[in-house]
């Protein structure tokens, strides 16, 4: 289990000509909010298909009213992160859709009106627990800058949040067969599996198969809130009206049956119907032994001579899981270089290479420029698997077919003059400034000496007025 987190940094006009009209006006003030939709794998599904990994909606941003005559700036954003919790393993590869919505706050009949301003989508590889990844996506004339990451919720760790960690019982080393939990070297990998159905929010376990409840929760799976006040009726009013939290009296509430057993109420209690291989009042006892052949895909069964002792499956290469039932995703190691598509054929790995690359792992860079032309005097630059054009002054785009003005985005700071140049642009800095784009004042203060405490920003600082 874990959380995918998305931080929107800015949403505003993209670079280049054709700045979009402001989405709000003095007559129609509005505010933005964002929606993110996540799907596992590198699927190219339609935007309408379900967000199988989860979805989230941001808060509303501050109200914005366009200043007449001013260029559309970056629009004010909602506070905070968008968080998409995931219950199972993090898939490592995922598709995302981020939508920017406008809420108009004029005198609409029947409340505010919503309209979709921009939608961006992409497919990414991402390991859980890694640093924030940054991204810029464009939708028409709009540009969205954002960061994202996936993090595991304790006790889960690892790039897929599938390993569990717990503090060491002995100071020097982990128990037999257990490894230290990188990066938490003071913790040990734990083969700890709580009772099936144990609430991940309100329950925990210190021994496999148990479910212990956090304060305020009860029931065999810690799904029943403990009463916090006296109530009017046996079932009590809802917490929304009085704050009274009362367990429903049904014996099957929260399903006390473990290991996929189904619960049915009896006049005095409950009864569990257990799946094959399990027995006991709550299906908590495994009746499977090595004699039953529980290990799949050629796994070797060890132990489990009688029903009360556990068996362990030692899996052959390429398989994992308590019964060797899962094929190891060897493609998760990303063996294909330069964006190649990995195919696990069982007996072998195969890489399907992008145009411009070859070799068993797509490691050979072919001549990207062979037979490719750049328009308007541009020259072809090799590398990256797709031909790139270095365009002549005044042209841009993939094949140098678009007219471009590198000075349109006001790239020079502090009053520097921008000049279009064959290499892109050149900033001629005002006296007292230097840097590629005049962003560094040589002597930032007019006074000959400063007070000992640094002044921070003052209204008189010359670099403030751009």
């Amino acid at each position: 289990a874990g959380v995918f987190e998305l931080q929107i940094h800015s949403f505003g006009p993209g670079p280049g000509p054709g700045a979009p009209r402001s989405p709000c006006s003095a007559r129609l003030p509005c505010r933005l909010f964002f929606r993110v939709c996540l799907k596992p794998g590198l699927s190219e599904e339609a935007a309408e298909s379900p967000c199988a990994l989860g979805a989230a909606l941001s808060a509303r941003g501050p109200v914005y009213t366009e200043q007449p005559g001013a260029p559309a700036p970056d629009l004010p954003l909602p506070d905070g992160l968008l968080q998409v919790p995931f219950r199972d393993a993090w898939p490592g590869t995922f598709s995302f859709i981020i939508e920017t919505w406008r809420e108009e706050l004029g005198d609409q009949i029947g409340g505010p009106a919503w309209s979709l301003l921009a939608r961006v989508a992409g497919r990414r590889r991402l390991a859980a627990g890694g640093p924030w990844a940054r991204d810029i996506q464009r939708a028409g004339a709009w540009e969205l800058r954002f960061s994202y990451r996936a993090r595991c919720e304790p006790p889960a760790v690892g790039t897929a949040c599938t390993r569990l960690c717990r503090p060491r019982s002995a100071p020097s080393r982990c128990g037999p067969g257990l490894r230290p939990c990188a990066p938490l070297e003071d913790e040990c990998e734990a083969p700890l599996v709580c009772r099936a159905g144990c609430s991940p929010e309100h329950g925990f376990c210190e021994q496999p198969g148990e479910c212990r409840c956090l304060e305020g929760w009860t029931g065999p799976l810690c799904t029943v809130p403990v009463s916090t006040s006296s109530c009017l009726s046996p079932r009590g009013p809802s917490s929304a009206t009085t704050g009274c939290l009362v367990p429903g009296p049904g014996p099957c509430d929260g399903n006390p049956c473990a290991n996929g057993g189904s619960c049915s109420e009896t006049p005095r209690s409950f009864e569990c119907t257990c799946p094959r291989g399990f027995y006991g009042l709550r299906c908590e006892v495994s009746g499977v032994t090595c004699a039953d052949g529980p290990c799949f895909n050629g796994g070797l069964c060890v132990g489990g001579a009688d029903p009360d002792s556990a068996y362990i499956c030692h899996c052959p290469p390429g398989f994992q899981g308590s019964n060797c039932e899962k094929r190891v995703d060897r493609c998760s190691l990303q063996p294909c270089r330069n964006g190649g598509l990995c195919l696990d054929l069982g007996h072998a790995l195969r890489c399907r290479c992008r145009a411009g690359f070859a070799g068993p792992r797509c490691e050979h860079d072919l001549d990207d420029c062979a037979g490719r032309a750049c328009a308007n005097g541009g020259t072809c630059v090799e590398g990256g698997g797709a031909h790139r054009c270095s365009c002549a002054l005044g042209f841009g785009g993939r094949d140098c077919r678009e007219r471009a003005d590198p000075c349109a985005a006001r790239p020079c700071a502090h009053g520097g003059r921008c000049y279009a140049h064959f290499s892109g642009l050149v900033c001629a800095c005002a006296p007292g400034y230097m840097g590629a784009r005049c962003e560094f004042p040589v002597h930032p203060d007019g006074a000959s000496a400063l007070p000992a405490a640094p002044p921070g920003l003052r209204p008189g600082d010359p670099q403030r007025y751009l």
Partner: nanobody, 117 residues
Framework: EVQLVESGGGLVQPGGSLTLSCAAS????????LAWYRQAPGKKRELVAG???????HYIESVKGRFTISRDNAKNSVYLQMNSLRAEDTAVYYC???????????WGQGTLVTVSS
């Protein structure tokens, strides 16, 4: 807003080395040009070294070949590696960031470097 926190200052002997670090945080750390300035007692604050958001580096003459500025975009940090330090390098060193998002400059609180035997 961008907040800048410097560290790594201290007392060092002439000819010694020191590395200053500056961590940027806040809502506008997306595209920053970063620099180190210094101010000796009774003198103006001056630019020492800068690194633009495209990675190009700029140094004043007196530190070329001795000081190296670098940045780690993943950590939103800038570093100043100072070698062959001289007494005239003694100053309060300030971290500076120019945000291309807000088009505003931001300053750290400063860290004291003293070169003395």
């Amino acid at each position: 807003e961008v907040q800048l926190v410097e560290s790594g200052g201290g007392l060092v002997q002439p000819g010694g080395s020191l590395t200053l670090s500056c961590a940027a945080s806040g809502s506008d750390v997306w595209y920053l040009s970063l620099a180190w300035y210094r101010q000796a007692p009774g003198k103006k604050r001056e630019l020492v070294a800068g690194i633009s958001d495209d990675g190009s580096r700029h140094y004043i003459e007196s530190v070329k070949g001795r000081f190296t500025i670098s940045r780690d975009n993943a950590k939103n940090s800038v570093y100043l590696q100072m070698n062959s330090l001289r007494a005239e390098d003694t100053a309060v060193y300030y971290c500076y960031a120019y945000s291309w998002k807000t088009r505003f400059p931001y300053w750290g609180q400063g860290t004291l470097v003293t070169v003395s035997s």
